[in-house]
């Protein structure tokens, strides 16, 4: 679809005659009538098969014609085409003489026609216009005529239509051979395609205007390209979606439990050294002068009764001292300057000579001791409390309290914590050292096999054309992350290329 | 050859949600050509453009009834869906689910058989 | 909002020519649709992108869009034709459809 467009610009018949030779009364009132057709050798008469056009009288004998283009006028004389612009034609020209008001061809004499102009040549579509000057022996004619397309046709032959559109079905505007240039931030055959934010993750990102990045289930981060970890994952990351992978030192199927209390919460105190033993459970050890479980306890040196033979303890800044008894001397009271004449044992003990009398030794009745006999017996020494038990002088006798999970006289025996069914669903129970375990049958997990979780829905393997799949525990389903070129929950569609269409 | 096949109920109270669903059948609702739109048409009178959805989820809606519509899509089972709130008698109307093709310039070369929706107490 | 509008209805005689007009603000610059649509079906597409024809919609069938004004137009019309055609057109991502006109084979 275009317009043949023919610009009059001068007509001169200076002598005022017609055709005939026969002068114009007054004078020659002058309209064009104009034919457009389609190519031919020699320019005949018949159909003017590309339009017609017809003037007013725009003067007497020689005058220039106005451009009136801009004000609505007839100049350029308009012929329009709904076709294909063939790039030839034909083109007659003829200047009339109107004798009154009624232009139409029958209502004139014949002899009326003042001249007659045939071209015909190549034309190809284009801003620029062409310059011709035909002359007679009587007139002459000058004219400018191009071939221009319609709004929204474009292309050599004015065959293409294109509409710049900027709504869902394509955001574009139209180069002059009628295809289509995408506006910024747009893509594909029909620009309805948006460019995302760059970096855009491709597979796990998608966008529905441009420089936007929208995540697909299970990923998330500005460009889509950091994956959700499984939901109340603690202290876990994640390398695909749903996954929590535990830091160091945390457990369990959200990283919640406490591999590493040592690190994380520091127990020991007074310079102990800490050593984890199992889920939130340590040990510390001591240094000299602390006990307790966490260390906190700072022990008097004297406790441990250094001072033999009835020597008295003090204790210091920087340590003990002994006061030691008449007859007795050393750091802790070890020596003696007694002998058995001197009756040096206490509380029937039997005194043996030694050393030619030099030294001696008492045998004490049972229940004391000391190297006079002079101290009870502290049925603790010898440590008897098995399993981390606190030994407890009572009197003549003794007891040991024992540490949560221990029982028995010398806490000799472990408390069964299996004893009271803790492990839910079927889960089976392992005492431990230090608490105990439980193993959970298939899609039962948590420290007592009390939370539901997933059998793995990836099992099936339900995703297609290669897909990635991820199994999403909180909601026993799974997800496909799709290869390049698929979609669906399965990837299981490829992702459509426009169709082709008969025109 | 592809097909589209509207679903939901006929009847719908005054100030309810009205609820629809097209399935696609013989084609893949993912294809980047087509967006899927729904249109309705009150008894003895013209069509009314209500919106429409493209695989990736983009919508885009008539703007007199914004407030009221959603569309959505389901790629895994080939459908889309509409939900129409705070429906009135002026709702009663036939719904028709309709293929607009990008290539077509948003022509719709395929439509369903239409269901009939009826706004009433 | 845009609008689209349609003569409520037009007359042809078997064979003749009937030519159905869609009139809007600068309607030359949108690509203009039709639909056909019988009594009791769904409608069909029947032009596109002003002027093109979908498969299987006969010859008789065509269009033209310039200006404000889109035209439907049935050459030979057949008893077959007569049914409501309803012109459609994007006003920025918002479709909108003419009135309807009915066409009625004399």
């Known amino acids: 679809s275009g317009v043949f467009q023919l610009q009059l610009q001068e007509f001169i018949n200076e002598r005022g005659v017609l055709a005939s030779g026969r002068p114009c009364e007054p004078g020659c009132r002058t309209f064009f009538r104009v034919c457009l057709k389609h190519f031919q050798a020699v320019v005949s008469p018949g159909p003017c098969t590309f339009g017609t056009v017809s003037t007013p009288v725009l003067g007497t004998n020689s005058f220039a014609v106005r451009d009136d283009s801009s004000g609505g006028g007839r100049n350029p004389l308009q012929l329009p085409f709904n076709f294909t612009w063939p790039g030839t034609f034909s083109l007659i020209i003829e200047a009339w003489h109107a004798p009154g008001d009624d232009l139409r061809p029958e209502a004139l004499p014949p002899d009326a026609l003042i001249s007659k102009i045939a071209i015909q040549g190549s034309l190809a579509v284009g801003q620029n216009w062409l310059l011709d000057e035909q002359t007679s022996t009587l007139t002459r004619l000058r004219y400018s005529y191009r071939v221009i397309c319609s709004d929204n046709y474009y292309g050599d032959n004015c065959s293409r239509l294109c509409k710049k559109r900027n709504d869902h079905f394509g955001h574009y505007v139209c180069q002059p051979d009628g295809n289509l240039s995408c506006l910024p931030g747009w893509t594909g055959e029909y620009c309805q395609q948006p460019i995302c934010l760059s970096g855009c993750h491709e597979q796990n990102g998608y966008c529905s205007k441009p420089a936007e990045c929208l995540c697909r289930p299970g990923w998330q981060g500005r460009l889509c390209n950091e994956c959700i970890p499984h939901n109340g994952c603690r202290h876990g990351t994640c390398s695909t979606p749903w996954q929590c992978t535990c830091d160091e030192g945390w457990g369990g199927l959200f990283c919640d439990q406490d591999l590493n209390y040592c690190t994380h919460h520091s127990p020991c105190k007074n310079g102990a050294t800490c050593s984890n033993s199992g889920q939130r459970s340590y040990t510390c050890t001591c240094r000299p002068g602390y006990t307790g479980v966490d260390c906190e306890l700072e022990l008097s040196e004297c406790d441990s009764n250094p001072c033999r033979n009835g020597g008295s303890c003090k204790d210091q800044e920087d340590g003990y001292h002994c006061l030691c008894p008449p007859g007795y001397y050393g750091l802790h009271c070890e020596h003696s300057t007694l002998s058995c004449a001197d009756s040096p044992c206490f509380n029937g003990g039997s005194c043996r000579e030694r050393n030619q009398g030099a030294n001696y030794a008492c045998e004490c009745p049972p229940n004391f001791t000391g190297s006079n006999c002079e101290k009870k017996v502290d049925r603790c020494t010898s440590n008897p409390c098995a399993n981390g038990g606190q030994c407890l002088n009572r009197g003549p006798s003794r007891m040991c309290r024992c540490r949560p999970g221990f029982t028995g006289t010398y806490c000799e025996l472990h408390v069964s914590d299996c004893a009271r069914n803790p492990c839910a669903h079927g889960g089976t129970c392992h005492d431990l050292e230090n608490g105990l375990m439980c193993t959970c049958p298939a899609g039962f997990s948590g420290r007592r096999c009390e939370v539901r979780t997933s059998i793995d829905a990836c099992a099936s393997s339900p995703c297609f054309n290669r897909a990635t799949c991820y199994t999403d525990l909180s909601t026993d389903t799974f997800v496909c992350n799709c290869p390049y070129g698929f979609v669906g929950s399965r990837c299981e569609f490829p992702v459509g290329l426009p169709p082709s269409f008969p025109w | 050859e592809v097909q589209l096949q509207e679903s939901g109920p006929g009847l719908v109270k005054p100030s309810e949600t009205l609820s629809l669903t097209c399935t696609v059948s013989?084609?893949?609702?993912?294809?980047?050509?087509?967006?899927w739109g729904w249109i309705r048409q009150p008894p003895g009178k013209g069509l009314e453009w209500i919106g429409d959805?493209?695989?990736?989820?983009?919508?885009y809606y008539n703007p007199s009834l914004k407030s009221r519509v959603t569309i959505s899509v389901d790629t895994s089972k080939n459908q889309f869906s509409l939900k129409l709130s705070s429906v009135t008698a002026a709702d009663t109307a036939v719904y028709y689910c309709?293929?607009?093709?990008?290539?077509?310039?948003?022509?719709?070369?395929?439509w369903g058989q239409g269901t009939l929706v009826t706004v009433s107490s | 909002s845009y609008e689209l509008t349609q003569p409520p209805s037009v007359s042809v005689s078997p064979g003749q020519t009937a030519s159905i007009t869609c009139s809007g603000q600068?309607?030359?610059?949108?690509?203009a649709s039709w639909y056909q649509q019988k009594p009791g079906q769904s409608p069909v597409l029947v032009i596109y992108?002003?002027?093109k024809r979908p498969s299987g919609i006969p010859e008789r069938f065509s269009g033209s869009n310039s200006g404000d004004t889109a035209t439907l137009t049935i050459s030979g019309t057949q008893p077959m034709d007569e049914a409501d055609y309803y012109c459609?057109?994007?006003?920025?991502?918002?479709?909108?459809f003419g009135y309807g006109t009915k066409v009625t084979v004399l």
């Open positions: 309709a293929r607009e093709g990008v290539p077509l310039g948003g022509g719709a070369d395929k």
């Open positions: 013989g084609g893949s609702i993912s294809s980047s050509s087509y967006y």
């Open positions: 959805i493209y695989y990736t989820g983009s919508t």
């Open positions: 600068r309607l030359g610059d949108k690509y």
């Open positions: 992108e002003d002027s």
């Open positions: 459609q057109a994007w006003d920025r991502d918002t479709g909108v």
